[in-house]
Interface confidence: low
């Protein structure tokens, strides 16, 4: 009931708490002398459901049968209306609509650790919408019974606060949960278990790893476990991997040897425990141990390439280049590279350790047979040396690959194709494709890139260190024993018309013709491989079309003669450059008047 109900009463039958779908009778009745002043037949009793009028009646009492009430609480209020006055609240009542508890399902109990306490969980089923009390009962051997109640409306977990011990691991325990409310009760099916069934060990702790003699092949993982643990499972992975390696071990007693770890790799290790082969559940995974495995001496061999440059009649410069070993081959931090240069006939050798970079340049006599060996060293040792005999890589003309072409293949890729050399193609042991940014003046500091290709291949896709709008000098070498032949071509992955034309820096007269000299276009303005230069000229102050001379581009060429100018006529000259994408704007203009005699 609500309010003081001084003027009358509201009664509800059969009960204030009803089952969903039931009908209730609500009666509102006035107490004596509480009706309207003067004439009681003018009493108008009105029944409200929340704030909505559902029934009314003139007189001292009102009866109303109500159906279809929803789950939850519904408020009914009775009011009195008299002529010429506001409605007066008489009394009210709340009706609670709910359901009987469903049978609790999936009752399961667990004890976390040998020293933990038994706690059970279950599924309540549908919401009763009423106050429902849950009672959890645990019975064991020797008529032991524990009982605990939960009065939380959403109760689905209870901890008994008791600890099962392993003294009689086969003893049976039975748990049951009962739900009760004013509309009924229901009990779960009993759940029967032993100590071994429900104890979930604590995750292992104090995990550490030891490498005997700092070797990855002698690695032992140690940990601590609760006393009754029989099984462990270990999982481990390189820190940068998503896939775990899994190992199951029995009676490990807190240690296990791992045989397949990779050197110089950070691993993550976790361990889980279980008390019995087929009973009970696995513990949570332990906290991760992260540890780096020791280095081992490098495996594999360096990929080494070289370049020769003539200095003078007696000396040549050798530039050696090599690629870093992969992480799996380096097996540690590479501390230095060891380069040994040896003159094969005289046996003279020099060795140098190189740190911090992957190239080395030296000057040697042009005479003699020279060989180099390069190896990589970490704290545990060195890789097998890569040995190369220094030869003239382009000396054997008959070994030169034919019809070399270079074509753009998508963003920042160039597809290089060739035909085998005329000389017996089966003599080719491998091809090497080499590329470097084209720099006028042949700057030897420009980084060199290369890849090796099997003798049956006639194409290679180069993508490493390829930039758009840069011209690359590409060479294809065919190697056979101590001989090599090569062919070269220029190529780019993307091109545009050059951003500027060549700058004419001098015009000189020689025997009735002129020699034009120009500065190369800066590399960053060439926008790809140059194909041609054009020299334009016309008479000064003339409106006629200029004449032009087109010169194929050659890296080293920076001058060209023109012999078709008339003497004592002033000409204006300028130059442009062309890539496959088009022609540049004009370079600077120069005037020139040929002084020679007329014919």
């Amino acid at each position: 009931k609500i309010d003081a109900c001084k003027r009358g009463d509201v009664t509800v039958k059969p009960s204030h708490v009803i089952l969903l779908g039931s009908t209730v009778n609500i009666t509102c009745s006035l107490k004596p002398r509480q009706g309207c002043f003067h004439y009681s037949r003018r009493n108008k009793l009105i029944l409200y459901k929340f704030d909505r009028r559902i029934n009314f009646h003139h007189g001292h009492s009102l009866n109303s049968q109500v159906t279809g009430l929803p789950l939850g609480t519904t408020l009914f209020v009775c009011k009195l209306a008299c002529i010429n006055s506001d409605e007066i609240q008489i009394c009210g009542a709340e009706i609670f609509v709910g359901v009987a508890p469903e049978q609790p399902q999936n009752l399961s109990c667990i004890q976390k650790g040998e020293q933990g306490t038994v706690a059970c969980t279950w599924e309540r089923g549908r919401d009763t919408h009423l106050y429902t009390e849950y009672t959890l009962q645990l019975s064991g051997p020797k008529n032991l019974t524990w009982q605990k109640q939960c009065k939380d409306i959403y109760c689905d977990y209870l901890d008994f606060g008791i600890n099962l011990t392993p003294e009689s691991p086969e003893s049976n325990f039975t748990a049951k949960v009962t739900a009760v409310n004013s509309l009924g009760s229901s009990s779960s099916l009993p759940s029967t278990f032993t100590f071994l069934d429900i104890v979930r060990p604590l995750p292992p702790w104090d995990i550490r790893i030891k490498f005997q003699k700092a070797s990855v092949s002698r690695c032992t993982l140690y940990w601590r476990d609760e006393g009754l643990v029989l099984l462990n499972r270990l999982r481990y992975r390189p820190s940068n991997s998503r896939l775990w390696n899994m190992v199951n071990v029995t009676k490990a007693k807190g240690r296990h040897d791992l045989l397949d770890l990779k050197p110089f790799t950070e691993y993550e290790f976790q361990i889980s425990s279980k008390l019995h082969l087929y009973k009970g559940s696995w513990s949570d995974w332990s906290e991760s141990l992260r540890a780096q495995t020791p280095e081992e001496e490098p495996t594999g061999m360096l990929d080494v390439w070289y370049m020769k440059r003539h200095i003078d009649y007696s000396r040549q410069q050798i530039s050696l280049f090599w690629k870093n070993l992969s992480v799996s081959e380096a097996r540690g931090k590479i501390l230095h590279y060891q380069v040994t240069l040896q003159e094969l006939t005289g046996g003279k050798a020099m060795t140098q350790n190189i740190t911090g970079h992957t190239s080395w340049t030296t000057v040697i006599p042009r005479t003699g047979n020279w060989a180099v060996a390069v190896s990589a060293a970490n704290s545990k040792g060195s890789s097998l040396p890569t040995r190369i005999n220094i030869m003239n890589l382009c000396e054997a003309g008959l070994l030169a690959p034919r019809q070399v072409s270079a074509n753009s293949e998508g963003m920042d890729n160039i597809l290089v194709t060739w035909q085998p050399p005329r000389k017996d193609p089966s003599a080719v042991q491998e091809y090497v494709v080499e590329w470097r940014e084209l720099h006028p003046g042949g700057d030897t500091q420009v980084p060199l890139n290369w890849l090796r290709s099997r003798p049956y291949n006639v194409s290679a896709l180069i993508s490493e260190n390829i930039k758009s709008y840069i011209c690359y000098e590409i060479r294809v070498y065919a190697l056979s024993g101590d001989q090599g032949g090569c062919s070269s071509i220029l190529g780019n992955s993307k091109h545009k018309a050059p951003l500027s034309g060549p700058h004419i820096n001098a015009i000189t007269e020689e025997k009735g013709s002129i020699l034009i000299s120009w500065n190369s276009i800066p590399v960053q303005e060439q926008m790809g491989c140059l194909l041609h230069y054009r020299i334009y000229w016309k008479e000064r102050d003339s409106n006629s079309q200029p004449q032009l001379c087109e010169i194929p581009y050659r890296v080293s060429q920076n001058s060209h003669p023109i012999n078709s100018l008339q003497p004592r006529v002033t000409y204006v000259l300028w130059m442009t450059a062309l890539t496959a994408a088009g022609e540049s704007s004009h370079g600077n203009e120069r005037e020139f008047c040929l002084q020679g005699k007329a014919n």
Partner: nanobody, 115 residues
Framework: QVQLQESGGGSVQPGGSLRLTCAAS????????MHWFRQAPGKGLEWVSS????????YYTDSVKGRITISRDNAKNTLYLQLNDLKSEDTAVYYC????????RGQGTQVTVSS
């Protein structure tokens, strides 16, 4: 894009000292190994020194060991090269680079050692 600006060069007598600075921008300096190169008049580019991204590992060419110290300040995106006991053969343009080939380098700063 990558920008490297060297400074601190100058003329100095043999036995003198200089500190070269390289201000870096346009890339993640703190995760990049850094390098110093030099180019003497009429000679090719020569590697001088390198330092790991965290600064823990340093490397030097034999001719400068004991006289040159490379260091870095990742908070300031700055690389340093301290030159001590300078000799006439140290005369060169000094460049800092973010790659070990010297391809990505700055404009350079001139160091001249003469009496």
């Amino acid at each position: 894009q990558v920008q490297l600006q060297e400074s601190g060069g100058g003329s100095v007598q043999p036995g003198g000292s200089l500190r070269l600075t390289c201000a870096a921008s346009g890339f993640t300096f703190s995760t990049s190994g850094m390098h110093w190169f030099r180019q003497a008049p009429g000679k090719g580019l020569e590697w001088v020194s390198s330092i790991s991204s965290g600064g823990g590992d340093t490397y030097y060419t034999d001719s400068v060991k004991g006289r040159i110290t490379i260091s870095r300040d990742n908070a300031k995106n700055t690389l340093y090269l301290q030159l001590n006991d300078l000799k006439s053969e140290d005369t060169a343009v000094y460049y800092c680079s973010k790659d070990p080939s010297g391809a990505t380098r700055g404009q350079g700063t001139q160091v001249t050692v003469s009496s």
